[in-house]
C-alpha cells in the first residue's frame, strides 16, 4: 500500500493519459483523482502501465467504491478485472451483456478463473434467468461451461452453440446432461456426411439412444473403446454381438480388456455365449447355449 503524500506542484493529473506511466506509485496515489479515474477507465486500457502501477489504480477505485464498482467502471476494467478477488466481484451488479463480453475477452484463452466463475454467477443471478444470448456468449468463450449447467438450464441451449464444443469440454458432463445435449448435437450436425458427422457427434454419444447406435453400426464408424465405455448402459444392452462388432470395427478386440467394466460387463450378460464366441476374444459370462431368455420388461408391459 502506498503511503499518503501530497501531490508535487504541477503534477496533478487533469486527464488519464500516457504521461502517467512516468509517475512513481506514490505520485499516482497522490496526483490522480479517483473520480477522474472512474470516468476515464477506458483510457487506462490504452496505456502500458506496469502491474505495480495498476495495483495503485485499483486501490484508488476500491477507496472510491467500497460497496462495489458501478457497471460504468466494471465495463472498462480490462486487465484490472484479473486483479479482482471473487469477494470484490460479489459486490457487483452486472446486467449488461456487453460488460460480460468485455471482461470475458480479457481472460480469453485461459481456463475459467474463480473471478470469471463468480462474474458469471453474479450476471446470471442479476438477469434472473439464463437466456439464449447469455448462453451463446458463455459457450462461445467457455464451451466447457455447458457441463456446469443443470439439465433444465441446458434445455434452452441453442444447437448453434454446440459447434464450439471441443471433446474435452464434455469430460465433466454426467449422463443426464448428455441426454439433453445429444439431441441438440444431432440436430446441429445433421447435414454433415457420415465420417465427418461421427467425428463431431462422438463426444456427445453418452446421451445416444439404442436406435442411433444401431444406425451408426451400419456406417463403418470404428468407434474407439473409450467412447464405447461412455455410452449409456441401457442403450448398449439391446445391441447384438454383430452390431457391436460393426460399431467398433477393429477396436472390437478391446472388449476383452473391459469385460469386467460397465457397460461391457452388463452387455456380455445379455448375449448368448455362442454369439460372443464368434468374436474369438474369449469373452465369458454370456447366456449358456440352450437357455431360454425371457424379456421380463416386455412381459410386465403387456400385463
Amino acid at each position: 500500500e502506498v503511503e499518503k503524500t501530497a501531490c508535487p506542484s504541477g503534477k496533478k493529473a487533469r486527464e488519464i493519459d500516457e504521461s502517467l506511466i512516468f509517475y512513481k506509485k506514490w505520485e499516482l496515489e497522490a496526483c490522480v483523482d479517483a473520480a477522474l479515474l472512474a470516468t476515464q477507465m477506458d483510457r487506462v486500457n490504452a496505456i502500458p502501465f506496469t502491474y505495480e502501477q495498476l495495483d495503485v489504480l485499483k486501490h484508488k477505485l476500491d477507496e472510491l467504491y467500497p460497496q462495489g464498482y458501478p457497471e460504468s467502471v466494471i465495463q472498462h476494467l480490462g486487465y484490472l478485472f484479473l486483479k479482482m478477488s471473487p469477494e470484490d466481484i460479489r459486490k457487483w451488479n452486472v446486467t449488461s451483456l456487453e460488460t460480460l463480453k468485455a471482461l470475458l475477452e480479457v481472460n480469453k484463452g485461459h481456463e475459467m478463473s474463480p473471478q470469471v466463475a463468480t462474474l458469471i454467477d453474479r450476471f446470471v443471478k442479476g438477469r434472473g434467468q439464463l437466456d439464449k444470448d447469455t448462453l451463446d456468449t458463455l459457450t462461445a468463450f467457455y464451451p466447457g461451461y455447458l457441463c456446469s449447467l443443470s439439465p433444465e438450464e441446458l434445455s434452452s441451449v441453442p444447437p448453434s452453440s454446440i459447434w464450439a464444443v471441443r471433446p474435452q469440454d464434455l469430460d465433466t458432463c454426467d449422463p443426464r446432461q448428455l441426454d439433453v445435449l445429444y439431441p441438440k448435437a444431432r440436430l446441429a450436425f445433421q447435414n454433415m456426411n457420415g465420417s465427418e458427422y461421427f467425428v463431431k457427434i462422438q463426444s456427445f454419444l453418452g446421451g445416444a439412444p439404442t436406435e442411433d447406435l444401431k444406425a451408426l453400426s451400419q456406417q463403418n464408424v470404428s468407434m474407439d473403446l473409450a467412447t464405447f465405455m461412455k455410452l449409456r448402459t441401457d442403450a448398449v444392452l439391446p445391441l447384438t454381438v454383430a452390431e457391436v462388432q460393426k460399431l467398433l470395427g477393429p477396436h472390437v478386440e478391446g472388449l476383452k480388456a473391459e469385460e469386467r467394466h460397465r457397460p461391457v460387463r452388463d452387455w456380455i450378460l445379455r448375449q448368448r455365449q455362442d454369439d460372443l464366441d464368434t468374436l474369438g476374444l474369449g469373452l465369458q459370462g454370456g447366456i449358456p447355449n440352450g437357455y431360454l431368455v425371457l424379456d421380463l420388461s416386455m412381459q410386465e408391459a403387456l400385463s
Epitope: V44, P48, T50, Y51, Y79, E105
Partner: nanobody, 115 residues
C-alpha cells in the same frame, strides 16, 4: 502473453545501445508499448511509450533527446534506441504492452550497465 527484451549489455559512458521488445505467443502490432527501467534498490520508472500505430511517443524528462522509441510492425518488434548513455542509465530495462480489452503483457527485462 509474454514479452522478451534483448539488446542489453555493458557500454561505456557516451555509448549507444538498441533494445528490442518482441512478443511471444501473440502479435505486438495492435499493442501500445512502454519501456521501463529499474536500478538496484529503486522503484521501477517509466522511460518511454509508443502507441500501437507508432504515431504517438512520450519520454521521461531524464531521457528526452537521448532515447528514441520506435516500432517495426512488419517485424512485430518495438525498439528503444539509447544514445549518449550515462552511468545513471544503468538498470534492468523492461517493456510492457497493452492491447484490445486491456490485455497486458510484461517482459522479464534486459540488463544495461554503463561503466
Amino acid at each position: 502473453l509474454q514479452l522478451v527484451e534483448s539488446g542489453g549489455g555493458l557500454v561505456q559512458p557516451g555509448g549507444s545501445l538498441r533494445l528490442s521488445c518482441a512478443a511471444s505467443g501473440f502479435t505486438l502490432d495492435s499493442y501500445a508499448v512502454g519501456w521501463f527501467r529499474q536500478a538496484p534498490g529503486t522503484e521501477r520508472e517509466g522511460v518511454s511509450s509508443i502507441s500501437s500505430s507508432g504515431g504517438s511517443t512520450n519520454y521521461a524528462d531524464s531521457v528526452k533527446g537521448r532515447f528514441t522509441v520506435s516500432r517495426d510492425n512488419a517485424k512485430h518488434t518495438v525498439y528503444l534506441q539509447m544514445n549518449s548513455l550515462k552511468p545513471e542509465d544503468t538498470a534492468v530495462y523492461y517493456c510492457a504492452a497493452v492491447g484490445d480489452y486491456g490485455r497486458r503483457a510484461m517482459g522479464q527485462g534486459t540488463s544495461v550497465t554503463v561503466s
